[in-house]
């Protein structure tokens, strides 16, 4: 059975979400990748995507979202800068492989943004800066208007797990017929 997991990130307004989506297989390196939000009862909505083919170490910016695909590490780095409370929600990375359905990469990200800026940075100097420097050369990419009824899922329960522990993985049950290619935690 498919096991769907999510990881919770709790940040303050103005901070930066900086996450990585791990794609296992080298064959996905050049595939176009996208960052999506999943709202209850709705189909995933694509917020930003890499170019097609996806270029190595080449930032793509859409509004406050920056995507960088690092082929050498098998990772898509996603940054959402200057977070707002309204950004709270469930997000996922997917790999576009037309005409096939998109491949979903886990973990899904449960983002919780709260009001008020914390003056004490997190465990890393890059993680919670209020002022974020956008990379000097960024590209906007056109995302496919790809939707599939098979990618609609029931919104998983909200996470109550502790943050930043190995146990902040939540196993979601009753998720059927989700897209079929993963990647590492």
């Amino acid at each position: 059975a498919t096991k769907l997991t999510e990881e919770k990130y709790e940040l303050k307004e103005g901070q930066t979400l900086d996450v990585k989506c791990d794609y296992t297989l080298e064959k996905f390196a050049s595939s176009q990748k996208a960052w999506q939000i999943i709202r209850d009862g709705e189909m995933p909505k694509t917020l930003a995507c890499t170019e097609r083919p996806s270029k190595n170490s080449h930032p793509v910016q859409v509004g406050r979202i920056i995507l960088e695909d690092y082929h050498d590490h098998g990772l898509l780095r996603v940054r959402m800068v200057n977070l707002q409370v309204e950004d709270s929600g469930l997000y996922q990375c997917v790999i576009y492989q037309p005409p096939k359905e998109p491949h979903m990469l886990f973990d899904r990200i449960r983002l919780v943004v709260t009001k008020g800026f914390s003056g004490t940075p997190g465990s890393n100097e890059n993680s919670t800066q209020n002022v974020y420097k956008i990379p000097p050369t960024t590209t906007k990419a056109l995302c496919p208007l790809y939707t599939s009824p098979r990618t609609v899922t029931q919104a998983p329960p909200k996470s109550t797990a502790d943050v930043s522990t190995p146990d902040s993985e939540i196993n979601l049950t009753n998720v059927t017929d989700i897209i079929r290619v993963p990647v590492f935690n």
């Epitope: 498919t2 990585k20 098998g74 491949h103 993680s127 990647v183 935690n185």
Partner: antibody, heavy 117, light 111 residues
Framework: EVQLVESGGALVKPGGSLRLSCAAS????????IHWVRQAPGKGLEWIGR????????KYSPKVQGRFTISAPTSKNTAYLQMNSLKTEDTAVYYC??????????WGQGTLVTVSS | EIVLTQSPATLSLSPGERATLSCRAS??????????LNWYQQKPGQAPRLLIY???YQKRGIPARFSGSGSGTDFTLTISSLEPEDFAVYYC?????????FGQGTKVEIK
């Protein structure tokens, strides 16, 4: 060329502390994950934990959780393993490793930590 | 945590022979059609080297005589014809769940 170089291994008494360093070159650690793995003399490999240097998020093996702390300031392009309350069973060669698609693809040469009175 | 059990502990073979190494997981390490199971080779005094990832995908630059197979809980590393430099210890490792874990290793020694 991608390279990881560990340092800081030493002889330390039980209950003591030690900080290992892992200097990366040829890539930016903020764009990947860094793992620590150890190997006791004549024994197998044991995964200690992982950090996402960009976000500072860590994962640990339950065996070392609470005693060991991984950090990785991206400005220094170096990862650290802070080891506290060391026990004789922590004696091992400690490796830092770079991540590629759910694997530990490139490894440092290792640094030996000996915990003994 | 997921426990990986490798067998045999030691495999005594001659150069040119076929080596078959087994790795069994205490629970499935496969998801979305991919198995999060990797194989590493380690020679004395050296760091481990990645050979096979996602159960059956050969890392670039690894000789074709190394192959991996399996899914779910049972995995195999095969060395089709042993070369002198292949005598080493082999570890399987899972990346399906935290903590990541290794098998205890299989030593392939010269008969």
């Amino acid at each position: 060329e991608v390279q990881l170089v560990e340092s800081g291994g030493a002889l330390v008494k039980p209950g003591g502390s030690l900080r290992l360093s892992c200097a990366a070159s040829g890539f930016n650690i903020g764009n990947t994950y860094i793992h620590w793995v150890r190997q006791a003399p004549g024994k197998g490999l044991e995964w200690i934990g992982r950090i996402d240097p960009a976000g500072g998020r860590t994962k640990y093996s339950p065996k070392v959780q609470g005693r060991f702390t991984i950090s990785a300031p991206t400005s220094k392009n170096t990862a650290y393993l802070q080891m506290n309350s060391l026990k004789t069973e922590d004696t091992a060669v400690y490796y830092c490793t770079g991540h590629r698609g759910g694997t530990m693809d490139y490894w440092g040469q290792g640094t030996l930590v000996t915990v003994s009175s | 945590e997921i426990v990986l059990t490798q067998s045999p502990a030691t495999l005594s073979l001659s150069p040119g022979e076929r080596a078959t190494l087994s790795c069994r997981a205490s629970q499935s390490v496969s998801n979305y059609g991919i198995s999060f199971l990797n194989w590493y080779q380690q020679k004395p005094g050296q760091a481990p080297r990645l050979l096979i990832y996602a159960a059956s995908y050969q890392k670039r630059g690894i000789p074709a005589r190394f192959s991996g197979s399996g899914s779910g809980t049972d995995f195999t590393l095969t060395i089709s014809s042993l070369e002198p430099e292949d005598f080493a210890v082999y570890y399987c490792q899972q990346s399906s769940n935290f903590p990541w874990t290794f098998g205890q290793g299989t030593k392939v020694e010269i008969k």
